[in-house]
């Protein structure tokens, strides 16, 4: 059937529309287009004869129509009057006519709308505002947007006048937003510029900042007032009811106790005519004195004396605070505070109690700190140390020994050789030594304040021959895969080379072996059972060499997963069952057995005579090494067959 499709159906003024013909018959003579719903010669727009491939304009032709050879009609520069029906009259070669009617609607291109308002400055909680979208346009739909969102659902929002008017009842400050209206018709949609609603509100109750109400004499008072308000509020300050100034900030330098009182901020909105006030009470305190610390013992002796530190001056109704090393007081049974916290007592002082100590006085506003105090704790001398640590020297070298002992005040030193006083110095120097300089070298340290003395003795050997070295170990029974062992070759000797052998071989290359301390120390990391070997160290210099006796490393390991023998698991009734359990372990492990989960005997061998099918089950061997603290086990299934059957033996 011949049909007409309008593309588009809704046409904007000034645009174009195509009346598209569907199902055009074959064998045509020509066709004509008419304005309206019927064929009317006076309303012919255009005709087209296929034989001449030529169009002829009719009385209703406006110059804006173009006919296509497929009978479709294009109308350009559409005007409002083009709205309506169009009829195509098709003349077939057999002179039988066919007609079809199509239609389209013409709508104006909408202008950009604008918003008018009945109240440019509405007052919060009092006024209503009506926005109207201009101009009024027929066949147009009106939409509203608030902050580019569609209208929220609210009982205070009402649309009227065909949605052209948006009324906001009882406006609030939250209605201060961007409002846009949009006009739509089938061919266009236009949005207005945004209108910002200027809601007058406030002032709200002002806030005074800072919130601080306590001040010290001599400080500056700087108060700021703010109240939410549109337009911005005008501010006034009152002190104890007396007007001061019309500013948002109140500044009083160098305040005194006399500036204590009630401070009122008044906020005024000239447009709404409303006033709101807020009052804050300011208290000004006199400046307290700076505290200081007194001590009952300026030179206490370590582990003997107690010290009492007192925070001065004594002030009633005052909180005292203490700090040690810039930290609050640690919890310690040796630290005691008096009831009022003013006195801190250190019981049995140690050298670590030197401080510094500070006390503080808390007032309403802040804490005043004392200057730091450092305790002069007398201690020592500790056992002196003689360096260097060498005990063996070759003839002809210089002997230079130094002594040091921790002490306050610093220790006084004396040297004795074989019990004879040599000199009162911290260092002892003997040049070009011989075998005769071998002997006992004693350093004596004396603390004159405490009267205490301590001595250390060192044996010095002067010999051309090196002594036979020995190996010391930091761990005589290391555990496999857990411990490290450090072997050290003794003695420490000057200008000496240290060497190591394992099982008579030079050291293997291994990431687990590390030499240090001038090769004097050999460390084995993460020892294994394979490290249980003979270790020998050697020392040599240009004239002699010597080796230590071997030291065998006793590595604790295991127990490994045990093995039950024999491997058989099938037995004939009446046979003897003799199971032996073995696990690699150092020291040897303790063995125990369980049959079907029931503990049996603590032996390495389990023997059961003349077994029967009742002895079927699981046989578990448990091993434990008390030295390594490790355990292991294995389970074996035993099957006992009645006599006469011959089960295949299986391992």
């Amino acid at each position: 059937k011949l049909t007409i499709e309008s593309t588009p159906f809704n046409v904007a003024e000034g645009k174009e529309v195509l009346l598209l013909v569907h199902n055009l018959p074959q064998h045509l003579f020509g066709y004509s287009w008419y304005k309206g719903e019927r064929v009317d010669g006076n309303r012919q727009i255009i005709g087209y004869v296929i034989g001449t491939q030529q169009a002829t304009p009719g009385p209703a032709y406006s110059g804006r129509e173009i006919i296509y050879p497929n009978a479709s009609l294009l109308i350009q520069n559409i005007i409002q009057n083009d709205t309506g029906f169009y009829t195509l009259h098709v003349i077939k070669s057999d002179l039988v006519n066919e007609e079809a009617t199509g239609q389209f609607r013409v709508y104006p291109e909408l202008p950009k709308p604008s918003i008018s308002s009945n109240n440019s400055k509405p007052v919060e909680d009092k006024d209503a505002v009506a926005f109207t979208c201009e101009p009024e346009t027929q066949d147009a739909t009106y939409l509203w947007w608030v902050n580019n969102q569609s209208l929220p659902v609210s009982p205070r929002l009402q649309l009227s006048n065909g949605n052209r008017t948006l009324t906001l009842f009882n406006v609030t400050r939250n209605d201060t937003a961007s409002y846009k209206c949009e006009t739509q018709n089938p061919v266009s949609a236009r949005r207005s510029d945004s209108v910002i609603l200027n809601v007058l509100y406030g002032p709200d109750a002002p806030t005074i900042s800072p919130l601080n109400t306590s001040y010290r004499s001599g400080e500056n008072l700087n108060l700021s007032c703010h109240a939410a308000s549109n337009p911005p509020a005008q501010y006034s300050w009152f002190v104890n009811g007396t007007f001061q100034q019309s500013t948002q900030e109140l500044f009083i330098p160098n305040i005194t106790v006399n500036n204590s009182g009630s401070y009122t901020c008044q906020a005024h909105n000239s447009d709404t005519g409303l006033n709101r006030t807020t009052v804050t009470t300011i208290t000004v305190y006199a400046e307290p004195p700076k505290p200081f610390i007194t001590s009952n013992n300026s030179n206490p002796v370590e582990d003997e004396d107690a010290v009492a530190l007192t925070c001065e001056p004594e002030i009633q109704n005052t909180t005292y605070l203490w700090w040690v090393n810039n930290q609050s007081l640690p919890v310690s049974p040796r630290l005691q505070l008096s009831n009022d916290n003013r006195t801190l007592t250190l019981l049995s002082v140690t050298r670590n109690d030197v401080g510094p100590y500070e006390c503080g006085i808390q007032n309403k506003l802040s804490v005043d700190h004392s200057d730091p105090v450092i305790l002069n704790v007398l201690y020592g001398p500790d056992d002196p140390t003689i360096s260097p640590s060498y005990t063996y020297y070759r003839p002809g070298v210089n002997l230079s020994l130094s002594c040091h002992a921790a002490s306050n005040p610093p220790a006084q030193y004396s040297w004795l050789i074989d019990g004879n006083i040599q000199q009162h110095t911290q260092e002892l120097f003997i040049s070009n030594i011989t075998e005769k300089n071998s002997g006992l070298y004693t350093c004596q340290a004396n603390n004159s304040a405490s009267g205490h003395s301590r001595t250390t003795v060192k044996t010095i050997t002067v010999s051309a021959e090196l002594p036979k070295p020995s190996i010391s170990s930091n761990n005589s029974k290391p555990v496999e895969d857990k411990d490290a062992v450090a072997f050290t070759c003794e003695p420490e000797a000057q200008n000496t080379t240290y060497l190591w052998w394992v099982n008579g071989q030079s050291l293997p290359v291994s990431p687990r072996l590390q030499l240090s301390n001038g090769n004097r120390t050999l460390t084995l990391f993460n020892v294994t059972r394979n490290d249980a070997r003979a270790y020998v160290c050697g020392i040599q210099n240009s004239v002699s060499a010597n080796r230590s006796d071997p030291v065998t490393l006793d590595v604790l390991y295991g127990p490994d997963t045990p093995i039950i023998s024999p491997p058989d698991s099938s037995y004939l009734s009446g046979a003897n069952l003799n199971l032996s359990c073995h696990s690699a372990s150092n020291p040897s492990p303790q063995y125990s057995w369980r049959i079907n989960g029931i503990p049996q005997q603590h032996t390495q061998v389990l023997f059961i005579a003349k077994i029967t099918p009742n002895n079927n089950g699981t046989y578990a061997c448990f091993v434990s090494n008390l030295a390594t603290g490790r355990n292991n086990s294995i389970v074996k299934s035993i099957t006992v067959s009645a006599s006469g059957t011959s089960p295949g033996l299986s391992a």
Epitope: Q44, T52, Q53, A55, G58
Partner: antibody, heavy 118, light 113 residues
């Protein structure tokens, strides 16, 4: 854009035949008729007739019957003018022209000069 | 056949001056059904094919400068060039497309004086 491109100049002897082609592009070939116009040297324009590109039906003006044939190959959007038994008086520029929707010739080929000389 | 007669045969006009060409048909080319005059004007510059200027006696083809205008009644028609330009030097033909066969006028040659 709409273009009509004609074949090149021809020099023929009397009694011979010539075939002038007119290749159309830039529009739907079968929607617009193709006209043929002759312009003898120094003379005016003379309409020879046209061919309906939709039906293939030719129309010849009196004086251009018999020796003159209009044809089409719509697969290559080309119209042809075939002149047989050429005479000296057939010497002219032959134009093809598209018949506009209203009738007048809205687009023309560049012309083909056919010279008949012994 | 409808005979189309143009006058003058040639015309010399100064640059910027008006040029007027006349065309007369031997019978009316007015179609009473739509009140249209079935007459066209063409311009042929030297060595080029003709170019459609005017149809329906007075409707300018798209892209044609507005200094070209056409007018006329049932049998008498005029092509006017309001201000002659150098590129307007050409031969101008009128043509009727009212009745088969369509016929051209003899042409008017326009030159610059």
């Amino acid at each position: 854009q709409v273009q009509l491109v004609q074949s090149g100049s021809e020099l023929k002897k009397p009694g011979a035949s010539v075939k002038v082609s007119c290749k159309a592009s830039g529009y739907t070939f079968t929607n617009y008729g193709v006209n043929w116009v002759r312009q003898a040297p120094g003379q005016g324009l003379e309409w020879m007739g046209w061919i309906n590109t939709n039906t293939g039906n030719p129309t010849y003006v009196q004086g251009f019957t018999g020796r003159f044939v209009f044809s089409l190959d719509t697969s290559v959007t080309t119209a042809y003018l075939h002149i047989s038994s050429l005479k000296a008086e057939d010497t002219a520029v032959y134009f093809c022209a598209r018949k506009g929707i209203w009738g007048p010739f809205d687009h023309w080929g560049q012309g083909t000069l056919v010279t008949v000389s012994s | 056949d409808i005979v189309m007669t143009q006058s003058p045969d040639s015309l010399a006009v100064s640059l910027g001056e008006r040029a007027t060409i006349n065309c007369k048909s031997s019978q009316s080319v007015l179609y009473s059904s739509n009140n249209r005059l079935y007459l066209a004007w063409y311009q042929q510059r030297p060595g080029q094919p003709p170019k459609l200027l005017i149809y329906w006696a007075s409707t300018r083809e798209s892209g044609v400068p507005d200094r070209f205008s056409g007018s006329g009644s049932g049998t008498d028609f005029t092509l006017t060039i309001s201000s002659l330009q150098a590129e307007d030097v050409a031969v101008y033909y009128c043509q009727q497309y009212y009745s088969n066969p369509w016929t051209f006028g003899g042409g008017t040659k326009v030159e610059i004086k």
